[in-house]
Interface confidence: medium
Amino acid sequence: VPRWRQQWSGPGTTKRFPETVLARCVKYTEIHPEMRHVDCQSVWDAFKGAFISKHPCNITEEDYQPLMKLGTQTVPCNKILLWSRIKDLAHQFTQVQRDMFTLEDTLLGYLADDLTWCGEFNTSKINYQSCPDWRKDCSNNPVSVFWKTVSRRFAEAACDVVHVMLNGSRSKIFDKNSTFGSVEVHNLQPEKVQTLEAWVIHGGREDSRDLCQDPTIKELESIISKRNIQFSCKNIYRPDKFLQCVKNPEDSSCTSEI
């Protein structure tokens, strides 16, 4: 008789999840000499141990501590780029500006980027059918708790000037409920971080509005200022040209506006 299985509202674990995590770990440690000491099998064991045999609505940050310890990594604290709802451009940017880092440029972020995973209480099985949805099922699920944990640690590590890319095409340019708005903003350390500089990325070709005046940006400024961190905001009108001109500042097209 097949065992009853909990049906969750979200998609199940990404297929070939263990193999994917292990392969990503090997690739990352090969590319990044400072992480060559990492034992990828131990990393996978720690990752697995965080959620296997545990109820997928009852995961805690403590469950991920062994993984956090193995994935400890020092990135230049003044070269951190946060992002909200504009991941692809942020990643394209750090691929060009190689001395800056998003969370997904770190080992732990790289391992989990775009993946879903969960287990089942009291069995060693990975659930490939469904996993809890943050809204419809529960917030303390394996994926959400992982990103909350690594995002908090990433923000805590930041210093000097921290940059954040925000999506100017969304109704809420700054969203208090995003990972950036709910976790990272509140874990920047005022004694280390001097300024948060927001880059609002415009979507429309003819959009020349000053989106730094948007009410949600003013809300972000207020939250940051109350934490004794300075706030700065920039409009990026032409993200395609912005990337091109960061890559090649001498390009003739870089004499016109971005």
């Epitope: 800056m100 000053d210 730094c212 700065s232 905001c233 409009n235 912005f242």
Partner: nanobody, 124 residues
Framework: QVQLQESGGGLVQAGGSLRLSCAAS????????MGWFRQAPGKEREFVAA????????AYADSVKGRFTISRDVTKNTIYLQMNSLKPEDTAIYYC?????????????????WGQGTQVTVSE
């Protein structure tokens, strides 16, 4: 956010020249519009000149047109204000600022990073 440091101010006689510099540090991979503003004792801070992110567009206050020239050296992350035919009414603290956009904006509200200022005094 960039840190901005002005230099080149001083005391000069009317009709003389000065060249102000503003060095930017803290973000070298992309630049935004930059401007010079000034504030005389008891007066509000006012726009003097601006230059866009690549140095291809400039804007000036009417009171300095033809006398002042703004320029930038992108490789050195520095902007300059060449001030000729100085007048006593040019006496003020001159501030360098970085804009929120890539353009040469004349509006003070479009600037969000400021230097400490450098004093320019023009005597009769």
């Amino acid at each position: 956010q960039v840190q901005l440091q002005e230099s080149g101010g001083g005391l000069v006689q009317a009709g003389g020249s000065l060249r102000l510099s503003c060095a930017a540090s803290g973000r070298t991979f992309v630049s935004f519009g930059m401007g010079w503003f000034r504030q005389a004792p008891g007066k509000e801070r006012e726009f003097v000149a601006a230059i866009n992110w690549r140095g291809s567009t400039t804007a000036y206050a009417d009171s300095v047109k033809g006398r002042f020239t703004i320029s930038r050296d992108v490789t050195k992350n520095t902007i300059y204000l060449q001030m000729n035919s100085l007048k006593p009414e040019d006496t003020a603290i001159y501030y360098c600022a970085e804009g929120r956009t890539a353009s040469a904006s004349t509006m003070i509200r479009e600037y969000d990073s400021w230097g400490q200022g450098t004093q320019v005094t023009v005597s009769e």
